[in-house]
Interface confidence: medium
């Protein structure tokens, strides 16, 4: 999936399986990514687990879990708030669009999370105070915590290089783990550009991600995924000057 | 990544020592600390296979759970945190002590916090 980190780095990660997105004293978020097509290096998020840890007199520990075709509007125990404590309503789940869009607000830690199902896959966005991000007992052990550290260099796909290649087949071939084609050949580059331009008129990294995803998969739903990801940034990012990211902010290989 | 069992141990030691000691008449607190500990060991299980300290912790938890009649399910305890205010700071004076001002607990401590964003989407 495409990752925008807490430090506004933008990466395309091929990480497969379960990976921690966030891990601190209050909140633990883990994603499971699966290949979008057989033989493809590109992966998308198929499962998301969010643990709100027990917090003082406010909330009991609550676990939220979403999977492909299952975006519940409740925690795994069936509740929609923080439990039986007096401050339970400082943690709330709201269903915005049934089966497609959920918002979780954890007021006690000033945090808002948006989870969506777009097509078959999930998207995740969070707004969280730096103070909460930094609330960790063991900095040395934070390891591969994607929102903070980004994904390891050997797990990154340099998708911006694909964008400079105007031939769709070139992009598809680069995205594949083997030479086998990974997406229908019927999706030319020009069509991908047109589809993405429709929803994302600014040629930023969200637009480029959209083009990459269409060329890689042929699945038009990824256009919406990029569009909603940018909409969520508009709602959640505190710096309105940083809504759009452009090529110069990307991680260079070896950095 | 390394086995994180010591993190679990030290969190448990911190939660159950000194002024945080589980009083014998306050078994729910102790059980909550044990459940947190058990959860911590489960999270690090994958990286701790074959680690004697890990297996010792798991057996120790089982012993203590049965000794103190703790149920496997129930509330967990909050590890002592250093960054946000302690529980006392998140309560404002009120005529109704039942009302918890958890909505204010964060903002009260840091009037205008610096927010940060992370997002994951697409492939």
């Amino acid at each position: 999936p495409h990752l925008r980190t807490f430090t506004d780095r933008f990466q395309t990660c091929k990480v497969q399986g379960a990976w921690p997105l966030i891990d601190n004293n209050y909140l633990n978020v883990q994603v499971t990514n699966t290949p979008v097509l057989p033989g493809s290096a590109a992966t998308a998020t198929s499962k998301l687990t969010i643990i709100f840890k027990n917090f003082q007199e406010c909330v009991d520990q609550k676990v939220y879990q979403a999977e492909m075709d299952e975006l519940p509007a409740a925690f795994v125990d069936g509740s929609k708030n923080g439990g039986d404590k007096h401050g339970a309503n400082s943690l709330k789940i709201t269903e915005k669009v049934s089966g497609q869009h959920v918002e979780i607000r954890a007021k006690y830690i000033g945090t808002t999370i948006v989870v969506r199902q777009v097509g078959r896959y999930l998207t995740f966005a969070v707004r969280v105070p730096e103070e909460v991000v930094n609330a960790v007992e063991d900095w040395d052990s934070q390891g591969l915590y994607l929102c903070l550290r980004g994904c390891p260099l050997n797990q990154q796909i340099d998708f911006q290089a694909f964008h400079t290649n105007t031939e769709g087949t070139g992009a598809r071939r680069l995205a594949a783990a083997s030479p086998a084609p990974t997406a229908p050949e019927t999706f030319p580059y020009e069509t991908a550009v047109a589809k993405c331009k429709e929803k994302l008129p600014v040629e930023d990294l969200y637009y480029q991600a959209c083009v990459f995803d269409l060329l890689t998969t042929g699945d038009v739903n990824f256009t919406l995924a990029a569009y909603y990801a940018l909409e969520d940034v508009k709602m959640l990012h505190s710096n309105k000057d940083k809504l759009h990211l452009y090529e110069r902010t990307r991680d260079l290989p070896g950095r | 990544s390394p086995c994180k069992i010591l993190k679990c141990n030290s969190e448990f030691w911190s939660a159950t020592s000194g002024s945080h000691a589980p009083a014998s008449d306050d078994t729910p607190e102790f059980c909550a600390a044990l459940r947190s500990y058990a959860l911590c060991t489960r999270r690090t299980a994958r990286t701790c296979r074959g680690d004697l300290a890990y297996h010792s912790a798991v057996h120790g938890i089982e012993d203590l759970m049965s000794q103190h009649n703790c149920s496997k399910d129930g509330p967990t305890s909050q590890p002592r945190l250093h960054t946000l205010p302690p529980a006392g700071d998140s309560q404002e004076r009120s005529d109704s002590p039942e009302i918890c001002h958890c909505e204010k607990s964060f903002h009260k401590h840091s009037a205008t916090p610096n927010y940060t964003h992370c997002g994951l989407f697409g492939d």
């Epitope: 007992e137 063991d138 900095w139 040395d140 052990s141 | 390394p2 086995c3 994180k4 069992i5 010591l6 993190k7 141990n9 030290s10 448990f12 030691w13 911190s14 159950t16 020592s17 000194g18 002024s19 945080h20 000691a21 589980p22 009083a23 014998s24 044990l34 500990y37 701790c48 680690d51 004697l52 300290a53 890990y54 010792s56 912790a57 057996h59 120790g60 938890i61 203590l64």
Partner: antibody, heavy 120, light 109 residues
Framework: EVQLVQSGAEVKKPGASVKVSCKAS????????ISWVRQAPGQGLDWMGW????????NYAQKLQGRVTMTTDTSTSTAYMELSSLRSEDTAVYYC?????????????WGQGTLVTVSS | QSALTQPRSVSGSPGQSVTISCTGT?????????VSWYQQHPGKAPKLMLY???KRPSGVPDRFSGSKSGNTASLTISGLQAEDEADYYC?????????FGGGTKVTVL
Amino acid sequence: EVQLVQSGAEVKKPGASVKVSCKASGYTFTSHGISWVRQAPGQGLDWMGWISPYSGNTNYAQKLQGRVTMTTDTSTSTAYMELSSLRSEDTAVYYCARVGSGPYYYMDVWGQGTLVTVSS
Amino acid sequence: QSALTQPRSVSGSPGQSVTISCTGTSSSVGDSIYVSWYQQHPGKAPKLMLYDVTKRPSGVPDRFSGSKSGNTASLTISGLQAEDEADYYCFSYAGTDTLFGGGTKVTVL
């Protein structure tokens, strides 16, 4: 075999600092805490504090707060205890000990001890 | 700092039983799962004999046993042997109020 091997004896002047090392072997260093305990000549044992090699978290005895610093180097599986502003009553044998595994806090393996003499 | 009080010395003949007490407060002993006992021979490092009040590490003979009643923990050596002559210390982990008892000299007559 699980072992803790400590550095050699030290003689220091009052006001100086001393740093004692404790090299661990035979087990996963980051899976156990390290405690430091001292024993003045003819006296009992005195707990100084502990450190988590895994995280660097420490817990010091109240009376030593501000004077003691415990650190670890996981690359060499070595723990260090530094005591500053030494006074004559700090003359003691200093032991490092591994904190036992599992939920119970106890010290199951001990170093051989390092004699620190503070004398003008 | 609260203290853990031990008798200065106890003695017994070979084969006899001796008990060493360790009295503290409710937080240091009464409610603690962290009481342990250490044996120290002259000029040597301490050795763990019991932890969690009653648990014996491997290698420690079963003639060493522990118990707790109220705010007092006890170490009992049954069938005393010559090599048991040593100093014994109780220990309680209680955060920043962690402490050893003053020590008990066990003499085998």
